[in-house]
């Protein structure tokens, strides 16, 4: 049963705010010619728009945006030796969130 | 090409480690028999383990875990009206974080 | 294998609402930008909208704007086209395509297709 | 709006061709031009991307070249697979745009 548990406390809304998600940096944002090469690193921190809103109606968005260039380094396999190149990622920031209407369908007039 | 960007600065690695991230409630969790009502809070956040290692043969994995019980909000509509009840959910929380080797599929003997 | 399934396409007469979805696999979803391209009965294609990996950017083709939104779920691998006020002209097969990164502005790879049909 | 006009509208080749599409784009676009391809009733597909890379997976008998205004895809030995659609695509700027196609029949 996995150990007795504590007292239940009343859950705790988690707000529409930005927090720190992992991006991958995957391969092909890099080349999308050949799969021979790694890169470093794998993954980084963004800061990303989160949380819930009052009802189905309204959903967390960002209000303000900023990219973020970063560099990476691809490293080729050329013959069994590593070749160190340098490449760019642009990385999307939320910088603020808002509780907005989500665009429904329009009813018919 | 599509606007011009600010200097690239070296991508740091996003390291395992927890991070707060949100959890939804999902109504199957409270009650599998009918849909016929809503959960307050519908997310809440949870702290998991996250973030990359330095090689594909190992993963960020928790190697501590606590269950955390909290008490929800069942709404049931009853002929238009709504009556509150309470229910509990069990919460996992990551309190720590490792890079531990994948296990590969063994080879048949 | 990369996979991008469409859905939510059908007959709509003109001035109603359609919602597009796009269920993604087979790659990091929410690495990528995503966009909408459309294919008129017998025509080329036509671009109509992006959105960055993130949700928090988003373009338009003049012939859509105000109109349609597009939208991301990155936790359910998904992207959306609600489409409103519909016309004749938006009869087409809709695709969706990854996009790449920030400055790649391509269609990497395509769904199906789903076909949206506008008629009184 | 940048204008992207495709040249041929169509061709009749034979299996072992070699084919030149061009793509004349209406202001200078760098090198962001990429090109598809397209069967009856499927997906388009990427071939090229920025002007000259060729996406991964796709045979080396394709290849792009251009920059600044004009583009040129070449097919250097034309294969039965190869009879389909051509578009060039241009991502300079938005709104994105496409040629008009090339469709490649069998002579």
């Known amino acids: 049963s996995l150990g007795s548990l504590t007292v239940a406390e009343p859950a705790m809304i988690a707000e529409c705010k930005t927090r720190t998600e992992v991006f991958e940096i995957s391969r092909r944002l890099i080349d999308r010619t050949n799969a021979n090469f790694l890169v470093w690193p794998p993954c980084v921190e963004v800061q990303r728009c989160s949380g819930c809103c009052n009802n189905r109606n309204v959903q967390c968005r960002p209000t303000q945006v900023q990219l973020r260039p970063v560099q990476v380094r691809k490293i080729e396999i050329v013959r069994k030796k590593p070749i160190f190149k340098k490449a760019t990622v642009t990385l999307e920031d939320h910088l603020a969130c808002k509780c907005e209407t989500v665009a429904a369908a329009r009813p018919v007039t | 090409s599509l606007g011009s960007l600010t200097v690239a600065e070296p991508a740091m690695i996003a390291e395992c480690k927890t991070r707060t991230e949100v959890f939804e409630i999902s109504r199957r969790l409270i009650d599998r028999t009918n849909a016929n009502f809503l959960v307050w809070p519908p997310c809440v956040e949870v702290q998991r383990c996250s973030g990359c290692c330095n090689n594909r043969n190992v993963q960020c994995r928790p190697t501590q875990v606590q269950l955390r019980p909290v008490q929800v909000r069942k709404i049931e509509i009853v002929r238009k009206k709504p009556i509150f009840k309470k229910a509990t959910v069990t919460l996992e929380d990551h309190l720590a974080c490792k890079c531990e080797t994948v296990a590969a599929a063994r080879p048949v003997t | 294998e990369v996979q991008l399934v469409e859905s939510g396409g059908g007959l709509v007469q003109p001035g109603g609402s359609l919602r597009l979805s796009c269920a993604a696999s087979?790659?990091?979803?929410?690495?990528?930008?995503m966009s909408w391209v459309r294919q008129a009965p017998e025509k080329g294609l036509e671009w109509v909208s992006t959105?960055?990996?993130?949700?928090?950017?988003?373009y338009y083709a003049d012939s859509v704007k105000g109109r349609f939104t597009i939208s991301r779920d990155n936790a359910k691998n998904s992207l959306y086209l609600q489409m409103n006020s519909l016309r004749a002209e938006d009869t087409a097969v809709y695709y969706c395509?990854?996009?790449?990164?920030?400055?790649?502005?391509?269609?990497?790879?395509w769904g199906q297709g789903t076909l949206v049909t506008v008629s009184s | 709006d940048i204008q992207m006009t495709q040249s041929p509208s169509s061709l009749s080749a034979s299996v072992g061709d070699r084919v030149t599409i061009t793509c004349r784009a209406s202001?200078?676009?760098?090198?962001?031009l990429n090109w598809y391809q397209q069967k009856p009733g499927k997906a388009p597909k990427l071939l090229i991307y920025a002007a000259s890379s060729l996406q991964s997976g796709v045979p080396s008998r394709f290849s792009g070249s251009g920059s600044g205004t004009d583009f040129t895809l070449t097919i250097s030995s034309l294969q039965p697979e190869d009879f389909a659609t051509y578009y060039c695509?241009?991502?300079?700027?938005?709104?994105?745009?496409f040629g008009g196609g090339t469709k490649v029949e069998i002579k």
């Open positions: 087979g790659f990091t979803f929410s690495s990528y930008w």
């Open positions: 395509a990854e996009s790449g990164g920030y400055t790649d502005w391509l269609f990497g790879y």
């Open positions: 695509q241009q991502s300079y700027s938005t709104p994105l745009t």
């Open positions: 202001q200078s676009i760098s090198s962001y």
């Open positions: 959105i960055s990996d993130g949700g928090g950017l988003t």
